[in-house]
Interface confidence: medium
């Protein structure tokens, strides 16, 4: 049976909470990697692909050691919300052109959404300050051409891949310090 009525619920182990978040992040990273491989295979595009609306990479050299949990979670959540928005935009704007990637893009969106909810839960369980609701972001302009949309897809998946790698590294290091 559970705890007697009125007794405080045992607070979850923060290391276990963080661990499950790390694992969800790694799963999403693997999904992103597989999708990136498919994208490169079906729509090859050499060179760097940038999208001004994407968040800048949160990590700089040597900064991993100085990370603090609140700032990592806050920044990660903000960046992933932006990537979720970009994936949704990509699916809407490029529906027919990226049809061959559609089941995987849909799965990616679902898992991204799940990770965001998990981060929100982790922040509340660790009693971190809750962020105010995000102001509505300006709508993303539709790609100027099919090729522009494919380049955008490369930029979005590439950026998400790096962001998730940074997140896993930061969260694993923070876990060892808890």
């Amino acid at each position: 049976p559970g705890p007697p009525p009125g007794s405080p619920r045992a607070s979850p182990d923060p290391r276990a909470e963080l661990d499950s978040t790390v694992l969800l992040t790694r799963s999403l990273l693997e999904d992103t990697r597989q999708l990136t491989i498919q994208l490169k295979d079906k729509f090859p595009a050499d060179g760097d692909h940038n999208l001004d609306s994407l968040p800048t990479l949160a990590m700089s050299a040597g900064a991993l050691g100085a990370l603090q949990l609140p700032s990592v979670l806050t920044r990660l959540r903000a960046d992933l919300l932006s990537y979720l928005r970009h994936v949704q935009w990509l699916r809407r704007a490029m529906g027919s052109s990226l049809k061959t990637l559609e089941p995987e893009l849909g799965t990616l969106q679902t898992r991204l959404d799940r990770l965001l909810r998990r981060l929100q839960l982790l922040m509340s369980r660790l009693a971190l300050p809750q962020l105010p609701p995000d102001p509505p972001a300006p709508p993303l302009a539709p790609p100027s051409s099919t090729w522009g949309g494919i380049r955008a897809a490369h930029a979005i998946l590439g950026g998400l891949h790096l962001t998730l790698d940074w997140a896993v590294r930061g969260l694993l290091l923070l876990k060892t310090r808890l």
Epitope: R26, S27, L29, M59, S60, A61, L162, W166
Partner: antibody
């Protein structure tokens, strides 16, 4: 062809430092992490740490923290591992290996660099 | 750190026979749809070579006679029909947590 080519064998005295290089070719350097693995005679393989070339942020096995330093030169597609305060138990073959981002499995390996620490 | 124990330490078989190598982890290395176990082959004087990643995925260029299975704490590398070039030492490795660690190896020898 995807290749990692390491610098040659080194013989060092206890207390000295050694710096090993690993030149990558045949793939986009920034798309993968570079990991370093130690194989001492009769011992199991041991992960030292890795570095993400894009963000230049290394992660170390706690056992090697403070003695191993991982760096990259992106323009030369080359990774480096420096090991300081050498002791006899550092005698080993050291490998660089290409690692998937945040998955820590290694699909391409260098040929290995033998480091001998002896007075 | 997670400890990986491989068995047997050595195994003597003939070409054409089936080889079954085991790797046991001190705690579960499977979660969220993935099992973080990988298998390598190493021959004397050479670097390790990745055979199987994430428990059951065959690395590109590796013959189909190699397969991986398992979840949780128990994993198996199977070589369905041994060829001369398969006689080597095999290592499992986990990447469930930092640091990744390796098993002590299974040496596969010709009988």
């Amino acid at each position: 062809e995807v290749q990692l080519v390491q610098s040659g064998a080194e013989v060092k005295k206890p207390g000295a430092s050694v710096k090993i290089s690993c030149k990558a070719s045949g793939y986009i350097f920034r798309d993968y992490n570079m990991d370093w693995v130690k194989q001492a005679p009769g011992q199991r393989l041991e992960w030292i740490g890795d570095i993400n070339p894009t963000i230049g942020a290394p992660i170390y096995n706690q056992k090697f923290t403070g003695r191993a330093t991982l760096t990259v030169d992106k323009s030369a597609s080359t990774a480096y591992m420096e090991l300081s305060s050498l002791r006899s138990e550092d005698t080993a073959v050291y490998y660089c290996a290409r690692g998937e981002l945040a998955h820590w499995y290694f699909d391409v390996w260098g040929q290995g660099t033998t480091v001998t620490v002896s007075s | 750190d997670i400890v990986l124990t491989q068995s047997p330490a050595s195994l003597a078989l003939s070409p054409g026979e089936r080889a079954t190598l085991s790797c046991r982890a001190s705690k579960s290395v499977s979660t969220e749809g993935y099992s973080y176990i990988h298998w390598y082959q190493q021959k004397p004087g050479q670097a390790p070579r990745l055979l199987i990643y994430l428990a059951s995925n065959l690395e590109s260029g590796v013959p189909a006679r190699f397969s991986g299975s398992g979840s949780g704490t128990d994993f198996t590398l199977t070589i369905s029909s041994l060829e001369e070039e398969d006689f080597a030492t095999y290592y499992c490795q986990h990447s469930r947590d930092l640091p990744p660690t390796f098993g002590q190896g299974t040496k596969l020898e010709i009988k």
